[in-house]
Interface confidence: medium
């Protein structure tokens, strides 16, 4: 029961986290600039991974996609890549984890298969969360190091001077959404990995066997039968009785006065 709850909660937390990563990636407010010194109007400028916007004091808002990839900082491209990788891994992880959920029955899927799928999705969620956290952190670092107070050094170009507008860059809402979402995805992934341990069938050193007492010649055999879970071997080499023992699959269907369990 605890395993099912842990797995289910991990799935839900990861789902919320991935939804948050998608939301952060699409948001326009990754960095915001208050153009306090603009003499024309109070202009509020904000930028996302895909476009930048300007909002005037009148309420007028305009957004435009970035014109070219060449004019964009390499770090922005890296952040885009990290966020997309995070989303893709998270989406695949969600798909895998749906089939891995203990509360969902799909055919005759064994617990060992569900355990493996849970672990796979958990790892995917962890990597997805790390990608999102890394992407947001890289962007935040880019703001702090490069743009905190943008330089207003003029340089002469064709047709006149060009300068970077004097603005104070601050963290946008998308950064905080990204950090929280990445953290949730990471936590969800860890929960899935924990749930995987509980889902893995415990190794049993016996199969249900029926013993056929053929006289008093009961042999004391080493090794014996062991559940073939694929999770290790009988290292303790426990001895079990096997007096003409047969597995329950081999036992005859008709009753016998000598058959007992």
């Amino acid at each position: 029961m605890a395993v099912t709850a842990c797995q289910g909660l991990g799935f839900v937390v990861s789902l919320i986290g991935i939804a948050g990563i998608i939301a952060a990636t699409c948001m326009d407010q990754w960095s915001t600039q208050d153009l306090y010194n603009n003499p024309v109007t109070a202009v509020f400028n904000y930028q996302g991974l895909w476009r930048s916007c300007v909002r005037e004091s009148s309420g007028f808002t305009e957004c435009r996609g970035y014109f070219t990839l060449l004019g964009l900082p390499a770090m922005l491209q890296a952040v885009r890549a990290l966020m997309i990788v995070g989303i893709v891994l998270g989406a695949i992880g969600l798909l895998v984890s749906i089939f891995a959920l203990k509360c969902i029955r799909i055919g005759s899927m064994e617990d060992s298969a569900k355990a493996n799928m849970t672990l796979t999705s958990g790892i995917m969620f962890i990597v997805s969360g790390l990608c999102a956290i890394a992407g947001v952190s890289v962007f935040a670092n880019m703001l702090v190091t490069n743009f905190w107070m943008s330089t207003a050094n003029m340089y002469t170009g064709m047709g006149g001077m060009v300068q970077t507008v004097q603005t104070r860059y601050t963290f946008g809402a998308a950064l905080f959404v990204g950090w929280v979402a990445g953290g949730l995805t990471l936590i969800g992934g860890v929960m899935m990995c924990i749930a995987c341990r509980g889902l893995a069938p415990e190794e049993t050193n016996y199969k249900a066997v029926s013993y056929h007492a053929s006289g008093h010649s009961v042999a004391y055999k080493p090794g014996g039968f062991k559940a073939s879970t694929g999770f290790g071997s009988n290292t303790k080499n426990k001895k079990i009785y096997d007096g003409g023992a047969r597995t329950e699959d081999e036992v005859q269907s008709y009753p016998s006065k000598h058959d007992y369990v």
């Epitope: 109007t41 400028n45 476009r51 930048s52 309420g59 305009e62 004019g71």
Partner: nanobody
Framework: QVQLVESGGGLVQPGGSLRLSCAAS????????MAWYRQAPGKQREFVSG???????NYADSVKGRFTISRDNSKNTLYLQMNSLRAEDTAVYYC??????????????WGQGTLVTVSS
């Protein structure tokens, strides 16, 4: 390549009028913020008038009621109609385009300037 070319400057008598033009290429004249600035000899560059994509218009207190800013989107040109000119309006007038949308780095583009001299 962005180019802002000012024209229409010259010598004018006090009380006279002039119309400055700023022909833009490589940039939309309905940019986020289009403005006129001026720089008198030995002084700092100062804001004269500006308008935004959203239609907000602002003027420096010293030119209010005398100067009018406008734009012609079809010609991609910004204008500054200057009436009742005074001697203190003598300066080099610069056209400015500030772009915030469609670029990761907000940019400010400047023309080379046109000289306006008000003298009798």
């Amino acid at each position: 390549q962005v180019q802002l070319v000012e024209s229409g400057g010259g010598l004018v008598q006090p009380g006279g009028s002039l119309r400055l033009s700023c022909a833009a290429s490589g940039v939309d004249i309905s940019s986020d913020v289009m403005a006129w600035y001026r720089q008198a000899p030995g002084k700092q560059r100062e804001f004269v008038s500006g308008l935004t994509r959203g239609g907000s218009i602002n003027y420096a207190d010293s030119v209010k009621g005398r100067f009018t800013i406008s734009r012609d989107n079809s010609k991609n040109t910004l204008y500054l109609q200057m009436n009742s000119l005074r001697a203190e309006d003598t300066a080099v007038y610069y056209c400015n385009a500030e772009i915030y949308t469609g670029t990761f780095y907000p940019r400010s583009y400047w023309g080379q300037g046109t000289l306006v001299t008000v003298s009798s």
